[in-house]
């Protein structure tokens, strides 16, 4: 699942890991876009170990993973990959 | 406001099941990221983590336990439990109740339980 | 499994008093360290979480910090109510473990 959120909320990561996941190992995908009290965008990654990390945005491997999810949905999928919630 | 109680019998012999009973308010089990889990501390010493149920039913044990405990829950009832058998004396301790869930920052064991102290006695 | 050594296991100290209780990893935990306040006859309530940061509504004389695989938790100026059993845990990898805790009493 890849989201992302539009929220109100300050910045949810208070560090960030630029370590490889392989997508097997990936459960779900949140990104939360820069603004709206954040001055950074910021990427949560669940893990199916039931961990959560975030991941640092200007690292390559989640640059491509995004890529791909973005490809795939968006030639797989009548909707849109990008689910906005506004609270 | 989230509160998680503990129940159990407060004594029992060596070689029984212990089986206790976690009942929580304020939140669910059954969002994405939700997840129940038991600790113990036996008198004046540390702590100790012995196993985690997830929302999607995903278990995790301590290993050092693991062919002992067997943890569930009542996802309707807002319950979860903790089976502990053939207790022996190293087993009295309290054991606490607690929360965790996965959101950013993730604080596993945000809340916790008031405990309920077990004691293990011939 | 990941060891957490915590040390003391026990101190003393005054109203005032600068304190700090550390913890250390035996593998790599990359800041998932939780330090615990229990008070006497209390369950555990978060402290500090990801090593550094202030759980809310926890007093500014609390700091956590890190140098390599060392965590510390300091209180700069002690106050009555900071007197009880302080406890890491790392939540790196399964099984999380605790440290063996810390007991903080007035001289």
């Known amino acids: 699942v890849l989201e992302v959120y539009y929220t109100s909320l300050r910045c949810r990561c208070v560090q960030e890991s630029s370590v490889f996941i392989p997508r097997r190992f990936i459960d779900r995908i949140q990104i939360l876009p820069r603004g709206n009290g954040c001055p950074r965008k910021e990427i949560i990654v669940w893990k199916k170990n039931k961990s959560i990390v975030c991941v640092d945005p200007q690292a390559e491997w989640i640059q491509r993973m995004m890529e791909v999810l973005r490809k795939r949905s968006s030639s797989t999928l009548p909707v849109p990959v990008f689910k906005r919630k506004i609270p | 406001q989230v509160t998680l109680k503990e129940s159990g019998p407060e004594i029992l012999q060596p070689s029984q099941t212990l089986s206790l009973t976690c009942t929580f308010s304020?939140?669910?089990?059954?969002?994405?990221?939700?997840?129940v889990g038991w600790i113990r501390q036996p008198s004046g010493k540390g702590l100790e983590w012995l196993a985690n149920?997830?929302?999607?039913?995903?278990?995790y044990y301590n290993p050092s336990l693991i062919n002992r405990l067997t943890i569930s829950k009542d996802t309707s009832n807002n319950q979860a439990f903790l089976k502990i058998t053939n207790v022996d004396t190293t087993d009295s301790a309290t054991y606490y109740c607690?929360?965790?869930?996965?959101?950013?920052?993730?604080?596993?064991?945000?809340?916790w339980g008031q405990g309920v102290m077990v004691t293990v006695s011939s | 499994d990941i060891q957490m050594t915590q040390s003391p296991s026990s101190m003393s100290a005054s109203l005032g008093d600068r304190v700090t209780i550390t913890c250390q990893a035996s593998?790599?935990?990359?800041?998932?360290l939780i330090w615990f306040q229990q008070k006497p006859g209390k369950s555990p309530r978060p402290l500090i979480y990801?090593?550094?940061n202030l759980a809310n509504g926890v007093p500014s004389r609390f700091s956590g910090r890190r140098s390599e695989s060392n965590y510390s938790l300091t209180i700069s100026s002690l106050e009555s109510e900071d007197m009880a059993d302080y406890h890491c845990?790392?939540?790196?990898?399964?099984?999380?473990?605790f440290g063996a805790g810390t007991k903080l009493e007035l001289k």
């Open positions: 607690v929360r965790s869930e996965l959101v950013m920052p993730y604080v596993p064991f945000d809340y």
């Open positions: 304020g939140f669910s089990l059954s969002p994405y990221g939700m997840g």
């Open positions: 149920i997830w929302w999607d039913d995903d278990k």
């Open positions: 593998q790599d935990i990359e800041n998932d």
């Open positions: 990801y090593a550094t």
């Open positions: 845990l790392q939540f790196k990898q399964y099984p999380y473990t």
